[in-house]
């Protein structure tokens, strides 16, 4: 099933201690899906979308950026025929960096 879209959303982190907010959204015909956020291939967080919504926002506490390394991806799962779980393709990667403040 098609990959979700992924995006870092504001407020954006300015240091590694700041929280990170990452939204993940399934295509239009998959509301209420279960979403998994990965970083460097490891599971970071799981969330379920409301039954009338296509997406979720993962809120990662400060320091989540430190390990493991690599970009974030997300994936969703839905119940298919015969109540079998179907997993989507992985989203595109999204990178998080911490800009040098411009004084």
């Amino acid at each position: 099933i098609p990959a979700p879209s992924i995006r870092l959303v504001p407020p954006y982190p300015s240091s590694q201690e700041d929280p990170i907010h990452i939204a993940c959204m399934a295509p239009g015909n998959f509301p209420g899906a279960n979403f998994t956020l990965y970083r460097g291939g490891q599971v970071v967080q799981l969330l379920q979308a409301p039954t009338d919504q296509r997406g979720v926002t993962f809120n990662l506490s400060g320091g989540s950026s430190k390990a493991p390394g690599g970009p974030f991806h997300c994936q969703y799962g839905v119940l298919g025929e015969l109540n079998q779980s179907q997993l989507s393709d992985l989203s595109e990667p999204v990178n998080v960096s911490f800009p040098v403040p411009t004084w």
């Epitope: 407020p11 959204m25 990178n95 800009p99």
Partner: antibody, heavy 120, light 111 residues
Framework: QVQLVESGGGLVQPGRSLRLSCAAS????????MHWVRQAPGKGLEWVAV????????YYADSVKGRFTISRDNSKNTLYLQMNSLRAEDTAVYYC?????????????WGQGTLVTVSS | QSALTQPRSASGSAGQSVTISCTGT?????????VSWYQQFPGKAPKLLIY???HRPSGVPDRFSGSKSGNTASLTVSGLQAEDEADYYC??????????FGGGTKLTVLG
């Protein structure tokens, strides 16, 4: 106060290139995602591209994908749109706009726009 | 990337209310709450009026309100004033990285 000032528009022949700039002031530019939105004469708004606060993630409308490149220089508080292989249908006023500070709070600040005319 | 559907025009008398609709699909307007409304005067840049369906930025009069039902979002302008005469655009995300606009609605305030 927040200011976004576009420049670089003008008359250009089909197939040629143009680079637009958007100079930002009055806010911490490096903390905001930035968009380009265009409006053909007498027509509605059309989203063109977005770039993340740090420049690492960029997305484009299908109509400009492969021809336009959005970029930013946070040290200069400036957003850019490199437009290649221009077509007559790219004729429009091009606006830069900043995302809100909160989640999905819309495009809360806009520049005054710069007119790009593609014609032979 | 087809535009969201808005009526081309709307009108109302001063003091009355008018509602402008914005119809999409379950893939955009109906699938989340990331709907915004913008006001644009001729020759000027758009101005944000409503975000996340019904939230007003500071400085926007409470005469402007937003709502959503199913795949249709609505902007209501109550207590119409002459200075409300402008073009109004809705926007929504088709996916997280693809912003769509409606075709725009020209609002006319009658005598």
């Amino acid at each position: 106060q927040v200011q976004l000032v576009e420049s670089g528009g003008g008359l250009v022949q089909p197939g040629r290139s143009l680079r637009l700039s958007c100079a930002a002031s009055g806010f911490t530019f490096s903390s905001y995602g930035m968009h380009w939105v265009r409006q053909a004469p007498g027509k509605g708004l059309e989203w063109v591209a977005v770039i993340s606060y740090d420049g690492s993630n960029k997305y484009y409308a299908d109509s400009v994908k492969g021809r336009f490149t959005i970029s930013r220089d946070n040290s200069k508080n400036t957003l850019y749109l490199q437009m290649n292989s221009l077509r007559a249908e790219d004729t429009a006023v091009y606006y830069c706009a900043s995302e809100g500070v909160d989640f999905w709070s819309g495009l809360d600040y806009w520049g005054q726009g710069t007119l790009v005319t593609v014609s032979s | 990337q087809s535009a969201l559907t808005q009526p081309r025009s709307a009108s109302g008398s001063a003091g009355q209310s008018v509602t402008i609709s914005c119809t999409g699909t379950s893939s955009d307007v109906g699938g989340h709450n990331y709907v915004s409304w913008y006001q644009q005067f001729p020759g000027k840049a758009p101005k944000l009026l409503i975000y996340e369906v019904s939230h007003r930025p500071s400085g926007v009069p409470d005469r402007f309100s937003g709502s959503k039902s199913g795949n249709t979002a609505s902007l209501t302008v109550s207590g119409l004033q002459a200075e409300d005469e402008a073009d109004y655009y809705c926007s929504s995300y088709a996916d997280l990285n693809n912003l769509m606009f409606g075709g725009g609605t020209k609002l006319t305030v009658l005598g």
